[in-house]
């Protein structure tokens, strides 16, 4: 059965009111599925299936956040499972469309400060940890949507109201217009339009690629900052290793971001992290006398 | 049904420190948030903080920031609160409460307490 | 902080009387407030969530009003077993906080 978060209201499953047409269905292959005699078909896809208890931990992680952000406490979470439910249930897995999520996107509705906006590219968790610490700035998963769906994954199949358990389309061995692509290309891009002032990005140095043009920072992200609006983009380049010293800020992909950026009439800085646990550690205690020098 | 099991009374020397435990059965343990209150002997209830076990993250009330570490581990569905530099002002029983969903932002459900004493 | 101030700090109540306590909060916490039981030696016991609702299997003597900043818990039909601590908490803002508790003892 359900958990106790569910008493009151158990989850229903319904068809999609209406389905689209579908021009492109994948390279999945088709599996048997069932029993009988006859065949029930399962597209078969190359990348991992949906989530356990997707449907549970969607709920309860909504729950969770309008318990610790009382800001969103207007917030109906059955209403927004509802929406996300309604998103990608009873739709091929490729052709999914911003569009699908403008319901969802409408309830999870936040206003975050402008000008406290963290991206990141490659290095989630240290990011994360930065904004657990320094509780006035805002990654994508601090706001309520990317709470929701953070390191989950979710499909459906089209015409059938069943969530596949079992595979789901691989952004490049499938399709790009999968239910988990859409709806971060979608929220990253209402996020990087939402910035102002100075923009931080969080960048990982270990990376061949410190900047990646094909990452959602890189694709979706940087061709979404508002030249209006946002004043400098400034990269936080994290270094690994204990003896690097070399600045990273002269990287040929650094220098390549620095191009997109002011030719969109943003300016540029770079800054090295060259020591990310003291970084982090000066950011908790900024009186420390170590955290004067140079981090 | 829903049970938070708190450890046993505990005895701290004035700068030491105690760890309290809150053992979560009856629903998963990532998908609730754990709260801690505290409550001096014969004095009301203050609330010290939260903790969301999934990802670790924690929100403590000014006044226990210096004082309390909120953790949680979710392969034993277990919470825990690290109380450092014990003083007699830190004697009191401590619970674990969490909420639920569809009734508010109340706790209607608490660990049976487990009591600091500070003495040396 | 919100300052949760409940009043009176104790009442000296007979079985099957009517008891009335208040809780005023230093700002506006909508309906935001919860209020609690708890009898020497027990975990603190939800009766009333988000001012006016009363929580699972809590008897219907016991209710809740109010919004704002000024709300009121009161008993009907006092039992012997009502005996106990009653408090209030605002669950509107971080940190929550608690009203300092009414004592109820009989005559």
């Known amino acids: 059965g359900l958990n106790d978060i569910f008493e009151a209201q158990k989850i229903e499953w319904h068809e999609g009111s209406h389905h689209h047409h579908h021009h492109h269905h994948g390279s999945g292959s088709l599996v048997p599925r069932g029993s009988g005699s006859v065949p029930r078909w399962r597209q078969q896809w190359s990348g991992p299936g949906t989530t356990k208890r997707f449907p549970e931990t969607v709920l309860a992680r909504c729950v969770k956040y309008t318990e610790i952000h009382p800001e969103m406490r207007h917030v109906d979470c059955q209403s927004v499972w509802d929406a996300f439910k309604g998103a990608f249930i009873s739709k091929h897995p490729c052709n999914i469309t911003e569009e699908d999520y403008q319901p969802l996107m409408k309830l999870g509705t936040q206003t975050v400060p402008c000008n406290k906006i963290l991206l990141w590219s490659r290095i989630k968790d240290l990011a994360h940890q930065f904004t657990q610490v320094q509780r006035d700035m805002f990654t994508l998963e601090d706001t309520l949507l990317g709470y929701l769906a953070d390191d989950l994954t979710w499909c459906g199949e089209f015409n059938t109201s069943k969530i596949n358990y079992q595979s789901c389309p691989d952004w490049r061995k499938d399709c790009s217009n999968n239910p988990v692509s859409v709806f971060w290309k979608t929220v990253s891009r209402r996020f990087a339009e939402a910035a102002c002032d100075v923009v931080h990005v969080m960048l990982n140095g270990s990376r061949s690629k410190i900047f990646d043009k094909n990452s959602t920072f890189g694709s979706v992200e940087v061709h979404n900052l508002q030249p209006e609006k946002v004043q400098t983009l400034e990269a936080w380049v994290i270094h690994g290793g204990r003896e690097d010293s070399r600045d990273l800020c002269q990287d040929p992909t650094i220098k390549e971001l620095e191009s997109i950026i002011s030719k969109r009439n943003i300016q540029f800085s770079c800054k090295n992290i060259y020591r990310p646990d003291k970084f982090l550690q000066c950011v908790k205690n900024p009186e420390d006398s170590s955290c004067t020098s140079e981090i | 049904e829903v049970q938070l099991q708190q450890s046993g009374p505990e005895v701290g020397r004035p700068g030491s420190s105690v760890k309290i435990s809150c053992k979560a059965s009856?629903?998963?343990?990532?998908?609730?948030?754990m709260n801690w209150v505290k409550q001096s002997p014969g004095q009301g209830l203050e609330w010290i903080g939260w903790i969301d076990p999934e990802y670790g993250r924690t929100d403590v009330a000014e006044k226990f920031k210096k004082k309390a570490t909120l953790t949680a581990d979710s392969s034993s569905s277990t919470a825990y609160i690290y109380l450092s530099g014990l003083t007699s002002e830190d004697t009191a029983t401590y619970f674990c409460?969490?909420?639920?969903?569809?009734?508010?932002?109340?706790?209607?459900?608490w660990g049976q307490g487990s009591l600091v004493t500070v003495s040396s | 902080d919100i300052v949760m101030t409940q009043s009176p700090t104790s009442i000296s109540i007979s079985v099957g009387e009517r008891v009335t306590m208040n809780c005023k909060a230093s700002?506006?916490?909508?309906?935001?407030v919860d209020w609690y039981q708890q009898k020497t030696g027990q975990s603190p016991k939800l009766l009333i969530y988000?001012?006016?609702n009363r929580y699972t299997g809590v008897p219907d003597r016991f209710t809740g009003s109010g919004s704002g900043t000024d709300f009121t818990f009161t008993i009907s039909n006092m039992q012997a077993e009502d005996l106990a601590v009653y408090y209030c908490?605002?669950?509107?803002?971080?940190?929550?906080?608690f009203g300092g508790g009414t004592k109820l003892e009989l005559k």
């Open positions: 009856g629903y998963t343990f990532t998908d609730s948030v």
């Open positions: 988000k001012a006016s």
């Open positions: 409460a969490r909420t639920k969903y569809n009734s508010g932002y109340g706790f209607p459900y």
């Open positions: 700002q506006n916490v909508d309906s935001d």
């Open positions: 908490m605002q669950s509107n803002t971080h940190p929550r906080t």
